[in-house]
């Protein structure tokens, strides 16, 4: 039975040209996280494998940075980056957990930086 829950940074906004951290946190399960995939629609942004580390998709390599932790940092934001982002936690033995974040990239300086709530610091052990 899947008992875990994913907390995310929820709906966030950032300024064009700036950067933003996408964060998810899996809690309430003892399942082992084997891999976390970060996705935007049908695009794979990055994979964080528990054993092998990070792979950033070549299309995003110039403006996506791994971390902090299992999170992802998007840089040099454009208005086209507005949309839904997903963190997909592949776990054993539970299976897959999915978290959703909506990012709005704004032209002006009205963007709120940071999340609505603090994501707990997540130590990942191999």
């Amino acid at each position: 039975m899947m008992t875990g829950t994913i907390e995310t940074t929820g709906n966030i906004s950032a300024e064009k040209g700036g950067s933003i951290i996408l964060q998810c946190h899996l809690s309430s399960t003892t399942a082992q996280v084997t891999q976390v995939n970060w996705e935007q629609q049908d695009q794979l942004l990055a994979i964080c494998n528990a054993d092998l580390g990070w792979h950033i998709s070549p299309s995003f390599k110039d403006r996506v940075a791994p971390g902090p932790g299992l999170g992802l940092t998007l840089q040099s934001l454009t208005v086209n980056d507005t949309g839904e982002y997903f963190c997909i936690y592949h776990t054993y033995p539970d299976g897959t957990y999915t978290g959703r974040i909506f990012l709005e990239v704004l032209e002006s300086s009205v963007a709120e930086h940071g999340a609505r709530f603090q994501i707990p610091h997540h130590h990942h052990h191999h």
Epitope: E39, I47, L52, H55, S59
Partner: antibody
């Protein structure tokens, strides 16, 4: 340039343990991921598992109870052990390198392969 | 496990022709797909990764496309040396899995 060379017996009997070695030259196995993949008669490829740069292992769940991948960093070699083999394990076995950072799970260097027949 | 299906296991073509090999994933794998070429008597060679990126040294007549569940590997102008079996592979999640292969015959 990275080069991989498999070695081991070409023939095994049912219920025996199959042991293969992979010698790596031109690159240290303390970087990247080191993998075993096999090709069955009729062309089907199966990913078997890896040992990572840090020594962590992943095994295909279909083999999990029978497979072990180990390494000897002083010899720059890694090994496959497959227990309780049957005729279904007859295949060409490849050792291979995977540069996860650059290519994800795409395998960029392969050994020449070693043919293993399981027969009584 | 994710199943990668290459529906055409055998394809016949002529030198200079354009040929496309398709691969269908049993679930959405986004762009986490690679293509390999295995010539007779040789080990597989990586041709395409991340669905559409050519690996180092791969001639530009080879291209990959697709995302989600449907992927295509295309040779724009087939050469005699392209005689091989071509495999797709997904690495969206473990266990990484391969298609059954498509054998390309040059007439």
């Amino acid at each position: 340039e990275v080069q991989l060379q498999e070695s081991g017996p070409g023939l095994a009997k049912p219920s025996q343990t199959l042991s293969l070695a992979c010698s790596v030259t031109g690159y240290s196995i303390t970087s990247d991921s080191w993998n075993w993949i096999r090709k069955f008669p009729g062309n089907k490829l199966e990913y078997m598992g890896y040992i990572s740069y840090s020594g962590n292992t992943y095994y295909n769940p279909s083999l999990k109870s029978r497979i072990s991948i180990t390494r000897d960093t002083s010899k720059n070699q890694f090994y496959l052990q497959l227990n309780s083999v049957t005729t279904e394990d007859t295949a060409t076995y490849y050792c291979a390198r995977l540069d996860f950072s650059n290519y994800g799970g795409a395998v960029d260097y392969w050994g020449q392969g070693t043919s293993v027949t399981v027969s009584s | 496990d994710i199943v990668m299906t290459q529906s055409h296991t055998f394809m016949s073509t002529s030198v200079g022709d354009r040929v496309s090999i398709t691969c269908k994933a049993s679930q959405n794998v986004r762009t986490a797909v690679a293509w390999y070429q295995q010539k007779p008597g040789q080990s597989p060679k990586l041709m395409i990764y991340s669905a559409s990126y050519r690996y180092t040294g791969v001639p530009d007549r080879f291209t990959g496309s697709g995302s989600g569940t449907d992927f295509t590997f295309t040779i724009s102008s087939v050469q005699a040396e392209d005689l091989a079996v071509y495999y797709c592979q997904q690495y969206y999640t473990t266990p990484w899995t391969f298609g059954g292969g498509a054998k390309l015959e040059i007439q």
